[in-house]
């Protein structure tokens, strides 16, 4: 039926062209909501990560670049640390004694994973090299 | 209700050892929250701390005293003890055990043991 | 050490007085300093805390004031029970030390 008629290729040149493209840099726009979806099924990779990588920084050393966990909550709270002096306070009016160790607040990030993702390889735990 | 209660021997002969264990009643000797101490008051006289402890073990003492002080915690009894070597008869005094807060604003004494009258004497 | 000097070390008092009672530390402890009342055979009793800071269930007439070396105990309407001696006693720094007492008695 498509050598006779070509309609499949019809119907794709009229989709192409109902979008009106000015240049050739819109056309990935296109296949990028065409794939997506598929890609992300297959892997997803932590832009956190690869901007750490690109800025050099040792923490991204050991990490992956498959991203494993797509929901996540984080908590910012203040505990009470213990001091070698009061030189190592966050600030003179957050600095205090219990008589024996010096103390001071510290803000503290705590991140909990809730939901990992929906892909192929999240749960491979393949060396990224 | 947070209870504290001093028990040992009244009586101590000169050069020997004095040993006295503080028991802790409804709450935990584990918790993180607080320090153990051991102040004394000799008769008609003011009061003297003569050192503290963590449930880890952590002790501090006083200076005065240090040489002759060994203060220890057993959590699964839920006591802590003092011991005080070489004693003399200006080791006559009424022993308190009590604790102050760790982590808080100054080390305040909010409980106390009743006391107990230790005498040195042969 | 800090070394803790009150004044007076004894007073007469009548009920209804206003009492007051100094503590002066021989170096600068900031607010670390606390008050107890103590009555003969009994353990001393935490009135006030971090200087000013009033111990749960401590009748509001005793309060308690000053910073660094200088600091003050007032009984604002003295009651029959009230007669005691009382220490303060510095949490600074250890040795934690004490004061040696004033006795307060009835006039």
């Known amino acids: 039926v498509e050598v006779a008629t070509h309609y499949l290729e019809i119907i794709t040149q009229l989709i192409v062209e109902s979008f009106h493209f000015k240049n050739g840099e819109d056309a990935p726009d296109l296949l990028k909501v065409i794939t997506k979806p598929f890609t992300k099924l297959i892997v997803q990779l932590d832009k956190k990560v690869i901007s750490q990588i690109a800025m050099n920084d040792e923490k991204a050393k050991n990490k992956s670049l498959v991203k494993i966990w797509c929901k996540t909550f984080t908590n910012k709270t203040q505990i009470n640390v213990t001091v070698p002096s009061t030189a190592n306070c966050t600030s003179p009016s957050l600095c205090w004694t219990d008589g024996i160790q010096n103390w001071t607040m510290k803000n503290v990030t705590y991140k909990e994973n809730i939901a990992k993702c929906q892909h192929i390889f999240v749960n491979f735990h393949l060396p990224d090299l | 209700q947070v209870q504290l209660q001093e028990s040992g021997p009244g009586l101590v002969k000169p050069s020997e050892t004095l040993s006295l264990t503080c028991t802790v009643s409804?709450?935990?000797?584990?918790?993180?929250?607080?320090?153990r101490g051991w102040i004394r008051q000799p008769p008609g006289k003011g009061l003297e701390w003569i050192g503290s402890?963590?449930?880890?073990?952590?002790?501090y003492y006083n200076p005065s005293l240090k040489s002759r002080v060994t203060i220890s915690v057993d959590t699964s009894k839920n006591q802590f003890s003092l011991k005080l070597s070489s004693v003399t008869a200006a080791d006559t005094a009424v022993y308190y055990c009590?604790?102050?807060?760790?982590?808080?604003?100054?080390?305040?004494?909010?409980?106390w043991g009743q006391g107990t009258l230790v005498t040195v004497s042969s | 050490e800090i070394v803790l000097t009150q004044s007076p070390s004894s007073l007469s008092a009548s009920v209804g007085d206003r009492v007051t009672i100094t503590c002066r530390a021989s170096?600068?402890?900031?607010?670390?300093l606390n008050w107890y009342q103590q009555k003969p055979g009994k353990a001393p009793k935490l009135l006030i805390y971090a200087a000013s800071s009033l111990q749960s269930g401590v009748p509001s007439r005793f309060s308690g004031s000053g910073s660094g070396t200088d600091f003050t105990l007032t009984i604002s309407s003295l009651q029959p029970e009230d007669f005691a001696t009382y220490y303060c006693?510095?949490?600074?720094?250890?040795?934690?030390?004490f004061g040696p007492g004033t006795k307060v008695d009835i006039k």
């Open positions: 009590a604790r102050h807060p760790r982590g808080s604003y100054g080390a305040n004494f909010d409980y």
């Open positions: 170096q600068s402890i900031s607010s670390y």
């Open positions: 006693q510095q949490s600074y720094s250890t040795p934690f030390t």
């Open positions: 409804g709450g935990s000797i584990s918790s993180s929250s607080y320090y």
């Open positions: 402890i963590y449930y880890s073990g952590s002790t």
